[in-house]
Structure formats: C-alpha cells, structure tokens
C-alpha cells in the first residue's frame, strides 16, 4: 500500500495505490484511490509510466482526454468513469503485454489540491492448475496441468499424509511453450501415489502462487484450486 501526498498546490490530497500484477493477454487493473471532490469537473486523473514520454491515460472535466496518450497505450486504457466521483482513479488496462511492467504514477488534481502515488506493476502469466488421476499410466499417477505461466515457475508436490516429504524423485515436470512463444504450459506428473491421501501441486513464480489439490479415496475424487498474486498485498 503506497500513500502519496502532493507537494505543490493549495493543499496536498491523499492518493493511495496498491502494487499489482497483470496476466498477459488478459485485462488488468492498476489500483488508485484518492480523497474525492464534490464535482466531477474539478477532478483530473493522470496516469504516467516511468520511461514513457506520453501519458498512459488522462481523465479531466468528466471525460477521457487522450490527445497526449502514448502510442503503446492507445485504445487499451479506461478509468471507471462512474466511480471517479467517489475517489476511484483505478485504470483498466486491456490486453496486458509483458512490456507493460514497470513503475506507474497515479497523479490527481482536485479543487483541494494535488497528490500522487507510485505503483509497481508486474506482468507475467499465471493460471489455475488442475490435478487429475492419470489412468493411462502403469502405476497410480497424478497429473497436474496449468495452461499459461511466465516466467517459468517452480513446481513442488506435497502430501497431507507425508508432510515434509520431498517428491522430486518421484515426479517429473515439463514446460511446453505455447503458440505465442511467451507463455508456457506446465505439466507435472507424480508417481506412486497412495489412496486416501490429499496431494497438492504448487506452482509458483515471482508473480503468483497457485495450488491444485486432489483427494483420492476408493469412492470419490475431490479437487480444489487456489491462486494468489504475490505482490498485491499491502506493503
């Protein structure tokens, strides 16, 4: 959580950002809130990116003002116009690219004054893993698949019964480049699994951590998945 205060102007206003991560090829949100003004026309929002000459986005007098927008963001940005009046300056970024990573500044001007705060935006690929029983294998085998990751993650298996056990000797992980030549499909196979146990396939890179659980009993199979962005917690 980063809180910034304006330096010049009548007064400083509080602007707050939260570090976040974007999933390439999908839409992302750069989060920014501010001390609101009573009239929309008195609010100016500017998003800037370190190393980029033009603006990422500008919103003023109640509408987008994109004449100074940098080419790399053309047609890809939007604010939540109906929420600006309540202090939401967050930016929606369409079709996130690897090159969108960097330091952004959310700069706000209202009738009370000015304020800004920086935001670290990471980009990569992350997806939910699915764990299944591999019935084609000669022994009891689990297969964990996740369609899109970047940068290359680590994969670790764990089990509820054998807590702390190292499964690296009885597992095999491969990374297959997807058609766009950036993201990769993650496939990890765990051999010699036992029944009535819960196994977890944990995939992690510097952006996200995802877990796929599977519980295999004689009568049923239960699955659960969870994904957590690593750098969006308050700091």
């Amino acid at each position: 959580l980063i809180i910034g205060f304006g330096i010049s102007g009548r007064h400083s206003i509080t602007v707050t950002t939260v570090a976040s991560a974007g999933n390439i090829g999908e839409d992302g949100i750069l989060s920014c809130t501010f001390e609101p003004d009573i009239k929309l026309s008195d609010i100016v929002i500017q998003w800037l990116k370190e190393g980029v000459i033009g603006l990422v986005h500008e919103f003023k007098e109640g509408k987008d003002e994109l004449s100074e927008q940098d080419e790399m963001f053309r047609g890809r940005t939007a604010v939540f116009a109906d929420q600006v009046i309540v202090g939401n300056a967050s930016l929606r970024l369409k079709n996130v690219q690897l090159t969108d990573a960097g330091t952004y500044k959310c700069y706000i001007i209202t009738s009370k004054g000015k304020g800004n705060a920086n935001l670290e935006y990471k980009t990569g690929a992350f997806s939910m893993p699915e764990v299944n029983v591999d019935y084609n294998a000669s022994s009891e085998t689990l297969r964990c698949e996740a369609p899109r990751w970047f940068p290359q993650p680590t994969v670790v298996w764990a089990s509820q019964v054998d807590q702390g056990a190292n499964f690296s000797e009885v597992s095999n992980t491969s990374f297959e480049l997807n058609s766009e030549n950036v993201t990769m499909k993650v496939v990890s196979v765990l051999y010699n699994v036992t029944i009535n146990n819960t196994y977890s396939c944990m995939i992690e890179n510097d952006i996200a951590k995802a877990t796929g659980d599977i519980k295999v009993t004689e009568s049923e199979i239960k699955r659960r998945s969870h994904l957590q962005l690593l750098n969006s917690k308050a700091s």
Partner: antibody, heavy 122, light 113 residues
Framework: QVQLQESGPELVKPGASVKLSCKAS????????IHWLKQSPGQGLEWIGW????????HYNDKFKGKATMTADKSSTTAYMQLSSLTSEDSAVFFC???????????????WGQGTLVTVSA | DIVMSQSPSSLAVSVGEKVTMSCKSS????????????LAWYQQKPGQSPKLLIY???TWESGVPDRFIGSGSGTDFTLTVSSVKAEDLAVYYC?????????FGAGTKLEIK
C-alpha cells in the same frame, strides 16, 4: 420503488456506542452512495458523510471524523453507521439518504429513510 | 465551509397566496465549467424526513408540483410557492453541494393562517 428502511429508536448511555442501520431496496445497492445526516434542534441538518457500497469508499465531514464510522454489507444491501463515545450533544435524529443519479456529483439526495432517533441519557 | 442563510425563519400565509423565501450562500454556487448552480431545496413536513423538491437551483424533482419554483444564481436564491395549499405546511431547507462539506440552511417554516 426505492426504499430506505432505518432501524428503530435508541436510548444509550453517555460514553457508549450505537450502530444504526439502513436497509436499501428497489435499486442496485452497489451503484449509489448512501449518505448519513444528523438533525438536531440546535444545529439543524448536518451532513456526516457517504459510503459507496460498490467499493467501500467513504468520505466524511471533518466534524464527524472519529465520531461516525460508515460501513455497508452488499449481501444484505444494508448500510450502517456506528457512533462512538456518545454525549448529550449526539442526541438527534439520524437519516440515511441515497445519492443522486448523475455520475458528475453524488448529490442531491432524492431518497431518504424515515430517520432514527438517538437519545443519549444517563 | 459554505454558510447558507435562509430568511425569513418563519412565515404564515393563507391558502392560495404566493410565498417566496430566500437563501443566500457565503460564496458563489455557480460553477463556471458547467454553468450550473449547485443548490437544492428540500421540504420537510412535521414528523417526516426531508423530500427533494428542486436541484440545480431550478430543476424540478420528478413528481414535484409546478407551483414550487426555484430561481436565482450565484449567491442569491429563491423558492417560490405560487399558490400555497394546506399540505405545504413544512420547513423548507436550501442545500449547497458546490463543495465539501455540503451544508444546509437553518430552514424557513411555512405556516398556514
């Protein structure tokens, strides 16, 4: 139709806290601000602040910072206001009201609850 | 904070008469960007909650009778009731929403003779 139903009257002791509720119906709760106002014989109508249930954003009148805390529960479409460290000065009728239709300002206040009388007395 | 001053504090008129009440703000409520006056009028009948009558100084809220007329600009505003009815017995408040915190006048109490 839009309705705001406030909780019943409260008799509270000095120093205590009270939590008032405002149940909204007839519109999309997360799309509009809910405002709280105080009406007392000595001070007339005073605006306390608003909450935007869609995001939880709040904005307070400086005069009521530390006195009032606004929250909202999306699942029950209910807004709440907690008043703390109550004194006789806090005895008043408190209203909730819904913010306006326009995205250019959260005013005026077109829909009001019936009001909750809070009496602070030992 | 913007101070809203209403006058008179009370007045008594007969049914059918025309009545005007005044509201003055300590600073202009006319916003140059949109040429709107950020002022509203509310009616509060005894034992009830306030009801919005007029916003943007002169725009009727839906369902409000056209005998209620809002006028004025800048710092001086007027609410006129062209032909008073018995049901108009109430306190009338002006409200500025030009800047935070929004503020209200002390009200004008309309009584029926």
């Amino acid at each position: 139709q839009v309705q705001l139903q406030e909780s019943g009257p409260e008799l509270v002791k000095p120093g205590a806290s009270v939590k008032l509720s405002c149940k909204a119906s007839g519109y999309i709760f997360t799309d509009y601000t809910i405002h709280w106002l105080k009406q007392s014989p000595g001070q007339g109508l005073e605006w306390i602040g608003w909450i935007y249930p869609g995001s939880g954003h709040t904005h307070y009148n400086d005069k009521f910072k530390g006195k009032a805390t606004m929250t909202a529960d999306k699942s029950s479409t209910t807004a709440y206001m907690q008043l703390s460290s109550l004194t006789s000065e806090d005895s008043a009728v408190f209203f909730c009201a819904r913010g306006g239709e326009s995205i250019t300002t959260v005013f005026p206040l077109a829909y009001w609850g019936q009001g909750t009388l809070v009496t602070v007395s030992a | 904070d913007i101070v809203m001053s209403q006058s008179p504090s009370s007045l008594a008129v007969s049914v059918g008469e025309k009545v005007t009440m005044s509201c003055k703000s300590s600073q202009s409520l006319l916003y140059s960007s949109d040429q709107k006056n950020y002022l509203a009028w509310y009616q509060q009948k005894p034992g009830q909650s306030p009801k919005l009558l007029i916003y943007w100084a002169s725009t009727w809220e839906s369902g409000v009778p056209d005998r209620f007329i809002g006028s004025g600009s800048g710092t001086d505003f007027t609410l006129t009731v062209s032909s008073v009815k018995a049901e108009d017995l109430a306190v009338y408040y002006c409200h500025q929403y030009y800047s935070y915190p929004p503020t209200f006048g002390a009200g004008t109490k309309l009584e029926i003779k």
